[in-house]
């Protein structure tokens, strides 16, 4: 009887045993290797014959386990659409990609293909922290208290108010979301707007 | 008793167009692969098509390929094989034949075969 | 495509006669090759498969071998009804090819 142990095999079910690495080929009716990463099929399997694989040629790819007769060709990461490169092309992995800082991605089909301008974050906000940069727009947070912002900008960070005290000095205005503390020389006599007022 | 009859033969001129039929019976035609083969007056056996057993895939040798086209309705238990721009050559006793369904891929049951002539 | 080459091409006989058929394929088909039998007007009927296994119905005078490249049909006593043309037919490789075929007469 036939050897059944390495691919070209008999199907009778149309399913091969090992799925990442084999396929059915219907009209052999077999089950035959399909080409490792970084090459493609030279020449097709047949009952008498496995699948031939070949490198992929330079500036082309097959990322995974495949039966293609060509492999895919390299494409650079576009700067007019906002991206750009973290790792070139190889035979085995495309070009990677990712937005340019400042930018996050505003079109996805399987990957990334068009990176859009931040969204500003107002005075006494700042943008939530994500888990992956540049895969979605800001989401503008409020300080949280004892924090202020004072830009309107993409990636400002709110900061903690200044302490008077730490710098030998006292509070003139408290701090807001949007302002940072006042301080002064204790010496000095109070600003206008609060003569009158007694401090304790 | 497993049968295929084919029908359709006949005279066309070259250029001309002709459909072949081969109704099956006795065995579940839905199961198996089915075959054209051709035999020229007075020479040996050709593979002219291929179909699977549910008429997704079809394959021809490049001397009809883009000219025939195999296909199957498995409700009517039937096979057809539409031939254009037919040529002198393609003159023959057409038979229709049915593809073992196990490991080893043989021809296990043969039509009577159909006459195309192709001739002005 | 694999070249299949049948001989002899003709070949007279008589009842009795032991008889050895062969065809040689241009590269090796793993035993996929299958031997047919026909009469004129008649189509052609399973023998042999997988170079060695008799077909159901067929006679036990009928034996096929070989392996590689290199197989044979033989008949060990000819019957009168065993005078047709015989032809090797590989299907381990589309297209699938047959043999010239083996015209086997009554000497």
């Known amino acids: 009887s036939q050897p059944q142990a390495v691919p070209p095999y008999a199907s009778e079910n149309q399913t091969c045993r090992d799925q990442e690495k084999e396929y059915y080929e219907p009209q052999h009716r077999i089950c035959c290797s399909r080409c490792p990463p970084g090459t493609y099929v030279s020449a097709k399997c047949s009952r008498i014959r496995d699948t031939v694989c070949a490198t992929c040629a330079e500036n082309s790819y097959n990322e995974h386990w495949n039966y293609l007769t060509i492999c895919q060709l390299c494409r650079p990461c576009d700067p007019v659409m906002g991206l750009e490169e973290i790792a070139p092309c190889t035979s085995k992995r495309k070009t990677q990609c990712r937005c340019q800082p400042g930018m996050f991605c505003a079109a996805w089909a399987l990957e990334c293909t068009h990176c859009e301008l931040l969204s500003d974050c107002p005075p006494g906000t700042e943008a939530e922290l994500k888990d992956e940069v540049g895969k979605g727009n800001n989401h503008c947070v409020p300080c949280k208290a004892g924090h202020f912002q004072n830009t309107s900008s993409p990636s400002a960070r709110c900061q903690p108010h200044t302490r008077c005290e730490n710098q030998g000095l006292v509070e003139a205005a408290p701090g807001t979301a949007q302002s940072d503390t006042t301080c002064k020389n204790p010496l000095e006599p109070l600003p206008p707007e609060m003569s009158g007022t007694m401090l304790m | 008793e497993v049968q295929l009859v084919e029908s359709g033969g006949g005279l066309v001129k070259p250029g001309g167009s002709l459909r072949l039929s081969c109704a099956a019976s006795g065995f579940t035609f839905s199961d198996y692969y089915m075959y054209w083969f051709r035999q020229a007056p007075g020479k040996g056996l050709e593979w002219v098509a291929t179909?699977?057993?549910?008429?997704?895939?079809?394959y021809y040798p490049d001397s009809v390929k883009g000219r025939f086209t195999i296909s199957r309705d498995n409700a009517k238990n039937s096979l057809y094989l539409q031939m254009s721009s037919l040529r002198a050559e393609d003159t023959a006793v057409y038979y229709c034949?049915?593809?073992?369904?196990?490991?080893?891929?043989?021809?296990?049951?043969w039509g009577q075969g159909t006459t195309v002539t192709v001739s002005s | 495509d694999i070249q299949m080459t049948q001989s002899p091409s003709s070949l007279s006989a008589s009842v009795g006669d032991r008889v050895t058929i062969t065809c040689k394929a241009g590269?090796?088909?793993?035993?996929?090759l299958s031997w047919y039998q026909q009469k004129p007007g008649k189509a052609p009927k399973l023998l042999i498969y997988?170079?060695?296994r008799l077909a159901d119905g067929v006679p036990s005078r009928f034996s096929g071998s070989g392996s590689g490249t290199d197989y044979t049909l033989t008949i060990s006593s000819l019957q009168p009804e065993d005078f047709a043309t015989y032809y090797c037919l590989q299907h381990g490789e589309s297209p699938w090819t047959f043999g010239g075929g083996t015209k086997l007469e009554i000497k």
């Open positions: 590269q090796d088909i793993k035993s996929y």
């Open positions: 034949a049915r593809e073992e369904n196990g490991n080893f891929y043989y021809f296990d049951y």
């Open positions: 179909i699977s057993d549910g008429g997704s895939y079809t």
């Open positions: 997988y170079a060695t």
